[in-house]
């Protein structure tokens, strides 16, 4: 793992909304040259968010991943203020940046220095959503879509950065945004090229210009504070690529805003998830539509461009 | 419709084993984590732990480590819990439940399943 | 852990009237609380999360609130069918914690 870095390679525009302590595995600060001081906070899904290190909920939840990495370490863990499971996902992923958040890929072509090391099972998983993020949705509606993968972790709105890539080299890409009424804003996140000669395992790519999204898809988390409870399910493009940055992610009451993920994760033997319609409750989510990326490998720049589904919105009553 | 589906009441003898299923149905069960809660009669609620389907990876309530085993076969949608090294302790209603991926309180809960630890 | 207390333990009421549960967690959960009811018998069912979200289907003479440590569980013009036991549930940490229930019953 490489962190012999000054210059700033994550920027904080905007700080995510409170997220439960228990769908947290890691944290760490921002570099000094950022300029903004931020808490890059690690989901068990491994997608990324910027937090603001004087919001309260944010100092207990660090204070909480200490105590819990030093009860790791005293049972011979190896973790660095991680704690949770870091395995190779055999489900897709999805990871997001916010629209405020800028990568900036080290020299070894990093995008951070997030990467999970790998150590115990029982170390390995600490959120508790849903293993990221909880796993069926319930929202004021009462109906559970298909629900989305595990890799995702609702998450607060336009904080995400992308999420790390638990040992892979396949890369997962999927737009995902919160359940909520009137249109998502899909903003930039701009990173600075790798270096072409960097081992392919260990490119970024960087996120360009993703197109406005009006009706983003969700990734199964529940839109915080809104009451809905959807059990989506997306089905995702996977690109043979490295960690790739990516965008915001946007969650009502983990803040409102536009979310767009990229996420990075192994290939599963699984293929992508079927996109059943299944739904029960009474919450009505809206509907959804998947982003795909395009990804060229020479550029390693990636364009999230909306495409509609009409399946994505089917529900189960 | 998201169900689901406890196996039947349990009558076993101090020292012995058990394992209760939990069939899910009305989702895709890969992706949503299965929780286990434990209440003695007349009882509050006792978080046990929580399985992912997707990948099998569990996490316990530390007070259930040693005593709690979780597994998930995602061929047939069900969850197992196995209690072992069976006390009167262990008798009660053990639930399992699902909930969202943005923090895990339950939405859907199964019947319940009744163990009863008596020699 | 946290620890979730509830009070009161129990509360007899009428059909009509309005009555507030409460819930204390022995540190700050940072409204990540959910409420249940349940009645004799049954599993529980979800009424509330984010400390006052309704959840679907649930009626809006059901209202939550607080912050910090100190939560509550208003029920206006009480039913017959919301009679039962409702208990509070953190998840802002694990392990997850439960309220020891409080037991609403018809006067």
């Known amino acids: 793992q490489h962190h012999g870095v000054t210059k700033c390679n994550i920027t904080c525009s905007k700080m995510t909304s409170k997220i439960p302590v228990a769908l947290l595995i890691h944290y760490q600060q921002n570099q000094a040259s950022c300029g903004k001081r931020a808490i890059i906070l690690e989901t068990r899904q491994h997608r990324l968010f910027c937090a603001d290190p004087k919001e309260q909920w944010v100092k207990d939840a660090m204070q909480h991943l200490d105590r819990q990495a030093a009860a790791l370490t005293r049972n011979g863990g190896t973790f660095e203020k991680q704690i949770g499971e870091v395995k190779p996902r055999t489900t897709p992923a999805a990871g997001g940046m916010d629209e405020s958040v800028v990568l900036e890929p080290e020299a070894t072509g990093e995008s951070s220095s997030l990467e999970p090391t790998p150590s115990s099972q029982e170390a390995q998983r600490a959120l508790g959503t849903s293993p990221e993020l909880p796993t069926g949705v319930t929202g004021s509606s009462g109906t559970r879509l298909p629900p989305t993968p595990k890799a995702q972790d609702g998450g607060p709105v336009g904080t995400e950065l992308f999420r790390v890539p638990p040992v892979s080299t396949a890369a997962t890409w999927q737009s995902s945004a919160p359940h909520q009424p009137g249109p998502s804003l899909w903003a930039e996140a701009k990173t600075s090229e790798a270096p072409s000669t960097q081992d392919p395992s260990t490119q970024a790519s960087t996120a360009s210009s993703p197109a406005p999204e009006e009706n983003a898809p969700s990734e199964g988390q529940r839109v915080w504070g809104q009451g809905q409870s959807p059990r989506p399910e997306n089905s995702l493009e996977r690109e043979e690529m490295g960690p790739v940055p990516a965008h915001t992610d946007a969650f009502q009451d983990w803040g409102p805003g536009s979310m767009a993920h990229v996420s990075v994760v192994p290939v599963s033997s699984e293929g992508t998830p079927s996109r059943e319609p299944v739904a029960s409750g009474s919450w009505t989510p809206k509907a959804e539509e998947p982003i795909h990326a395009t990804m060229d490998p020479q550029r390693l720049g990636v364009l999230i461009t909306p495409v509609p589904d009409a399946q994505a919105a089917t529900r189960r009553q | 419709q998201v169900q689901l589906q406890q196996s039947g009441p349990e009558l076993v003898k101090p020292g012995a084993s058990v394992k209760m299923s939990c069939k899910a149905s009305?989702?895709?069960?890969?992706?949503?984590?299965i929780h286990w809660v434990k209440q003695r009669p007349g009882q509050g609620l006792e978080w046990i732990g929580w399985?992912?389907?997707?990948?099998?990876?569990?996490k316990f309530n530390e007070r259930f480590k040693g005593k709690t085993t979780l597994t998930a076969d995602k061929s047939s949608n069900t969850a197992y819990m196995l209690l072992s090294s069976l006390t009167s302790e262990d008798s009660a209603i053990y639930f399992c439940?699902?909930?969202?991926?943005?923090?895990?309180?339950?939405?859907?809960w199964g019947q319940g399943t009744t163990l009863t630890v008596s020699s | 852990d946290i620890q979730m207390t509830q009070s009161p333990a129990s509360l007899s009421a009428s059909v009509g009237e309005t009555v507030t549960i409460t819930c204390r967690a022995s540190?700050?959960?940072?409204?990540?609380l959910a409420w249940y009811q349940q009645k004799q018998g049954k599993s529980p069912q979800f009424l509330v999360y984010?400390?006052?979200t309704l959840a679907d289907g649930v009626p809006s003479r059901f209202s939550g609130s607080g912050s910090g440590t100190q939560y509550s569980l208003k029920i206006n013009s009480l039913q017959p069918e919301d009679f039962g036991i409702y208990f509070c549930?953190?998840?802002?940490?694990?392990?997850?914690?439960f309220g020891g229930g409080t037991k609403l019953e018809i006067k």
């Open positions: 399985i992912y389907p997707g990948d099998g990876s569990p």
């Open positions: 009305g989702y895709t069960f890969t992706n949503y984590y």
């Open positions: 549930q953190q998840f802002w940490s694990t392990p997850y914690t």
């Open positions: 984010n400390e006052k």
């Open positions: 439940a699902t909930g969202p991926t943005d923090g895990d309180y339950f939405d859907y």
């Open positions: 540190g700050n959960i940072h409204n990540f």
